[in-house]
């Protein structure tokens, strides 16, 4: 015979337990029915009558089968920094979670008790660990060759764009600005390798830009600490290199010829020696043994034919650790120096060993007092590379970077009066350098 199904309330067999969705009432000593979710026990069972259940009132709930005398109160309304992801019903509690841009700083069994705004990484810093529902963003300084120009809790540092010719070098908080040529986010596949001594790591540069009256400084990010990308020189590298070489040779010859002619005409020559000196960069102790590499630009005065040179080289930044002071939530710690590098400097990618300087200057000097003789403008392009150990050179050593010789004495020997009239015939212009030396 099948076992008889017991209806609640019933007395359990000795040693047995009540069935699912039943509870044992100590007073009645009977197995009685539980109330379903959304209800509570209005009247407890007796030996003869089962539990009487009633629906939960507004703003109260029960989530499980139960025999509680009162429903549980729903949590308070969500605060302004939270969103209600689950409404309060008779069967479930209200759940508040942090709204976008915030994270849960103090959680409770379900949802969040206290939300805090995600830290925002300021310019020069990027997200190194994205925030989650329960953890804050971690900001880290942008590595050399990368930047972040936003105050954001989501933006990571991004690589600088690569220019044919750079107008403003990038730094940690600013992308490189290119001079009206199409930039790319990395190296061009075709590369012009300048005939310079090469180190073990090859450098990809962009094709030589057109000649220009303004001085230009090509800007490149040295490669990462990875093996050289051999063989990536484009097919047009050789012809372009040849053209550059021939042009430079031609200009040199023209200059020499002009100088000889002027000497023959018995104009009194004055060989001006102008030097733009760029000191060796000391290692940046604040960043370890070597600071971010700097790009020193030799810039001329507003006139493109000025002979007055000035070296614009910004100081190395000094960066302290970023999160070692207390800070208000939502704002990246400001322990670091604001800009990692000022206008004259640019970060290069990690692989560059030592500071690379690529200088292209066009100097027009030479004029006689009667304006009848001129010396052609020459483009002097010199590269300095303080190779892997800056300590080898004395800290204050001055490195001559550009010499213009062969100017002609006018009545006054100030740089301003050394500029001659350029009306009689156009001056041959120097070809700006194609890019940094392979490193």
């Amino acid at each position: 015979l099948p076992a008889q199904v017991a209806f609640t309330p019933y007395a359990p067999e000795p040693g047995s337990t009540c069935r699912l969705r039943e509870y044992y009432d100590q007073t009645a000593q009977m197995c009685c029915s539980k109330c379903s979710p959304g209800q509570h026990a209005k009247v407890f069972c007796t030996k003869t009558s089962d539990t009487v259940c009633d629906s939960c009132e507004d703003s109260t709930y029960t989530q499980l089968w139960n025999w509680v005398p009162e429903c549980l109160s729903c949590g308070s309304r969500c605060s302004s920094d939270q969103v209600e992801t689950q409404a309060c019903t008779r069967e479930q509690n209200r759940i508040c979670t942090c709204r976008p841009g915030w994270y849960c700083a103090l959680s409770k069994q379900e949802g969040c008790r206290l939300c805090a705004p995600l830290r925002k990484c300021r310019p020069g810093f990027g997200v190194a660990r994205p925030g989650t529902e329960t953890s804050d963003v971690v900001c880290k300084p942008c590595a050399p060759g990368t930047f972040s120009n936003t105050t954001s809790s989501t933006d990571i540092c991004r690589p600088h764009q690569i220019c044919n010719v750079v107008a403003i070098p990038g730094n940690a908080s600013m992308d490189a600005v290119c001079t009206s040529t199409s930039p790319t986010r990395s190296m061009a596949p075709g590369a012009v390798h300048l005939p310079q001594p090469v180190s073990t790591r090859s450098q990809h540069t962009q094709p030589t830009p057109e000649p220009s009256t303004a001085p230009s400084t090509s800007f490149l990010l040295p490669m990462g600490p990875s093996p050289p990308a051999e063989g990536s020189t484009g097919d047009f590298a050789l012809p372009v290199g040849l053209i550059v070489g021939v042009t430079a040779l031609g200009l040199l010859i023209i200059g020499v010829v002009n100088c000889v002619i002027m000497t023959q005409v018995k104009k009194k020559p004055l060989c001006l020696q102008r030097e733009a000196k760029v000191p060796h960069l000391p290692a940046d102790k604040a960043r370890g043994t070597q600071g971010p590499e700097q790009q020193h630009l030799l810039i001329t005065a507003p006139s493109s034919s000025s002979s007055s040179l000035e070296s614009s080289a910004s100081a190395l930044d000094r960066r302290a650790p970023t999160r070692n002071q207390p800070q208000a939530p939502g704002v990246e710690a400001s322990g670091a120096g604001e800009a990692r590098a000022s206008t004259g400097s640019s970060d290069s990618s990690p692989g560059g060993h030592g500071t690379q300087v690529n200088v292209t200057c066009i100097v027009n000097v030479c004029s006689s007092s009667d304006h009848s003789s001129q010396c052609s403008s020459q483009a002097s392009s010199t590269m300095g590379d303080t190779d892997s150990s800056p300590s080898e050179s004395p800290k204050d050593e001055q490195v001559p970077f550009s010499k213009e010789e062969c100017a002609f004495r006018s009545q006054l020997e100030t740089p301003e009066t050394l500029l001659g009239s350029t009306e009689e015939k156009p001056l041959p212009l120097g070809v700006p350098d194609a890019g940094m030396k392979p490193s």
Epitope: V138, R287, Q290, R319
Partner: antibody, heavy 118, light 110 residues
Framework: QVQLVQSGAEVKKPGASVKVSCKAS????????IHWVRQAPGKGLEWMGR????????EYAQKFQGRVTMTTDTSTDTAYMELSSLRSEDTAVYYC???????????WGQGTTVTVSS | EAVVTQSPATLSLSPGERATLSCRSS?????????ANWVQQKPGQAFRGLIG???DRAPGIPARFSGSGSGTDTTLTISSLQPEDFAVYYC?????????FGGGTKLEIK
């Protein structure tokens, strides 16, 4: 010049622990996470975890939870990875790295070979 | 834990050809929140990060390398293979608080 120099090869018995060091130079160690990645013979890369040298916070791959400890000593610019309860399948080359998909600061140690054999 | 699957395991091509390497997440579509990365390994040489943030080339990486993400896959494309590009490539995806590497794709000369 940025460099990560790791300690030498280790031979360990099953059940033992190994502690690999990674000395950073050429940059401020607190500026970037240090990751630990391993490569078993003939196998691919396996990310073990990373440590933030600035505050010591760590994130570990689930597989290594409870068995790996990553620390840094900022006074010596050195990061450490300790793996306990070694088994033969932990035989691999262990790399420390500043590689991070967030930073592009891409440097790797030369690797430390750990051999677990009875 | 999420599993990242790379395909193909081996890819045989000739210099000058176009290579397409794929990376799939077991947890569904690869989103920008996965910050997909590609790393190159050559025998006896240091690893090199190529792509970060799904499609940004790392500084110094030639333009023939490009990354993209669509649907369940993230892809590394090498537009015209150079002899030095033959290596093993790993993708790595970020999952909330950890990186997961794929099994790797060996790119070999045909």
């Amino acid at each position: 010049q940025v460099q990560l120099v790791q300690s030498g090869a280790e031979v360990k018995k099953p059940g033992a622990s190994v502690k690999v060091s990674c000395k950073a130079s050429g940059y401020t160690i607190t500026d970037f996470y240090i990751h630990w990645v391993r490569q078993a013979p003939g196998k691919g890369l396996e990310w073990m975890g990373r440590v933030d040298p600035e505050d010591g916070n760590t994130e570990y791959a689930q597989k290594f939870q409870g068995r790996v400890t990553m620390t840094t000593d900022t006074s010596t610019d050195t990061a450490y990875m300790e793996l306990s309860s070694l088994r033969s399948e932990d035989t691999a080359v262990y790399y420390c790295s500043t590689w991070d998909g967030f930073s592009y600061f891409d440097y790797w140690g030369q690797g430390t070979t750990v051999t677990v054999s009875s | 834990e999420a599993v990242v699957t790379q395909s193909p395991a081996t890819l045989s091509l000739s210099p000058g050809e176009r290579a397409t390497l794929s990376c799939r997440s077991s947890t569904g579509p690869v989103t920008t929140n996965n910050y997909a990365n590609w790393v190159q390994q050559k025998p006896g040489q240091a690893f090199r990060g190529l792509i970060g943030g799904t499609n940004d080339r790392a500084p110094g990486i030639p333009a023939r390398f490009s990354g993209s993400g669509s649907g369940t896959d993230t892809t590394l494309t090498i537009s015209s293979l150079q002899p030095e590009d033959f290596a093993v490539y790993y993708c790595a995806l970020w999952y909330r608080n950890h990186w997961v590497f794929g099994g790797g794709t060996k790119l070999e000369i045909k």
